[in-house]
Interface confidence: low
């Protein structure tokens, strides 16, 4: 004998991004020589048994046994979400219902606010927006590997009705560091299976210069020829070199180029040289020692630099 | 000694095209931005296009939009304007200019490095 249970198809529900195909199953096992049909949210049959009942290419038959009717959809809309019912034609007619999602896959994110010349210690606003989510997206921010805290997203139903656009700033104050840094903000969505969606916005930061000089040889002796390359860094690179030594009044103005050249080291050379390096963001002098050595192969470390 | 050179300019009838160059020497420019400027007779020097260091990033002014391409190749440490469709009003000395810093500008202010200029004459 067997149970009414034995009639009752069962099916399962689905989860689709929008876009991709989606297969619904219905089985039963005892099909007391009826056939399996489904039929849409709006209630329009879609197969009955083998045989289509909807022109709608998207629709294709998988499985059409007695005991299974399969059916797949490909290219899903949003519009397709819904309950799908399953129906057996026994009596009474017996339904399951598969319950479709649509997952909306949110747009690349769009990042505005970007103002150019930021300045060392400016504060920086940015803010990212995504559309098209279901359900809405969570954005993030970071800047290189270091997360960045912005405000919480903010969520928009967009005019469909079904999907979403979200919403995020970030506020931070920049340093010399985050000159050429990159500010990603991310979009995290279930549709996007782990999958990175996110938008870079490179930031130039203007910084006041530094430099140091380098002597070249290291330990200068008498005799040698010695260069003295004064390394400016910031942005805008510094463009500007006045090199001085220092002990004179005034200063002993010696040249304007980035490196100071002795073809022929004397002992009279010895002394403290400045190099000012200076860019439209402002100067740095910075400061070095020359004493030259005696023409012995021992090395000294007495000339220093800073 | 930085240099920027352009090329390219010349006389061609409206509806015609050029395509100017510009060469950096002295310095590897590659990591910075490069922008084009021109100048009319008797009118101040005005903005045309501009493109980041790695050319990512282009800009145009409004007269240059859908007419001319900015572009670079930075192994050549060159940077090119193509300019099609080209009218009456676009005959100026365009210069090539640089910034010390890898941001484009918009305004003459933003470069540090200009050009010497080459003239385009656009007349039938």
């Known amino acids: 004998n067997l149970s009414q249970d034995d009639s009752q198809p069962w099916t399962s529900d689905e989860t689709v991004v929008a876009g991709g195909t989606v297969v619904l199953k219905c089985q039963v096992k005892d099909h007391e020589d009826s056939s399996l049909q489904w039929s849409n949210p709006a209630q329009q049959t879609l197969y009955f048994g083998e045989k289509r009942a909807l022109r709608d290419n998207r629709i294709q038959l998988v499985t059409s046994t007695p005991h299974e009717l399969s059916i797949s959809i490909s290219n899903v809309a949003l519009a397709d979400e819904g309950e799908y019912t399953c129906s057996i034609f026994t009596m009474p007619v017996r339904t399951a219902k598969s319950l479709v999602t649509v997952l909306g896959i949110p747009q690349k994110p769009i990042i505005t606010g970007y103002k150019s010349s930021l300045r060392e210690k400016d504060t920086a606003t940015l803010n990212c927006q995504s559309s098209g989510s279901k359900p809405a997206a969570r954005l993030t921010w970071r800047k290189g590997d270091q997360e960045l805290h912005g405000e919480p997203t903010r969520i928009q139903e967009d005019p469909n009705g079904k999907t979403f656009t979200v919403s995020s700033s970030v506020t931070f104050q920049v340093t010399r560091e985050d000159d050429g840094a990159s500010i990603v903000c991310s979009v995290n969505h279930e549709s996007l299976k782990g999958a990175d969606r996110s938008t870079s916005q490179r930031i130039e930061v203007l910084y006041t210069p530094t430099a140091m000089i380098r002597p070249d040889p290291p330990h200068p002796r008498e005799g040698q020829k010695l260069l003295l390359h004064c390394e400016g860094r910031g942005n805008p690179v510094p463009q500007q070199y006045l090199w001085e030594k220092e002990g004179s009044v005034p200063p002993l103005k010696m040249t304007q180029e980035s490196a100071l050249i002795f073809p022929f080291l004397n002992k009279s050379d010895s002394g403290t040289y400045g190099c000012t390096a200076t860019s439209n963001m402002g100067s740095y002098k910075a400061y070095y020692t020359l004493n030259v050595n005696d023409p012995s192969p021992v090395p000294s470390s007495s000339s220093t630099y800073h | 000694q930085v240099q920027l050179v352009e090329s390219g300019g010349g006389l061609v009838q409206p509806g015609g095209s050029l395509r100017l160059s510009c060469a950096a020497s002295g310095r590897t420019f590659s990591n910075y931005a490069r922008g084009w400027f021109r100048q009319a007779p008797g009118k101040e020097r005005e903005f045309v296009a501009a493109?980041?260091?790695?050319?990512?990033?282009?800009n145009y002014a409004d007269s240059a939009k859908g007419r001319f391409t900015i572009s670079r190749d930075n192994s050549k440490n060159t940077v090119y304007l193509q300019m099609n469709s080209l009218r009456a009003e676009d005959t100026a000395v365009y210069y090539c200019?640089?910034?010390?810093?890898?941001?484009?500008?918009?305004?003459?202010?933003?470069?540090?490095?200009w050009g010497q200029g080459t003239l385009v004459t656009v007349s039938s």
């Open positions: 493109i980041d260091y790695s050319g990512g990033s282009t």
């Open positions: 200019a640089a910034p010390a810093s890898r941001r484009p500008s918009w305004d003459a202010d933003g470069y540090d490095y």
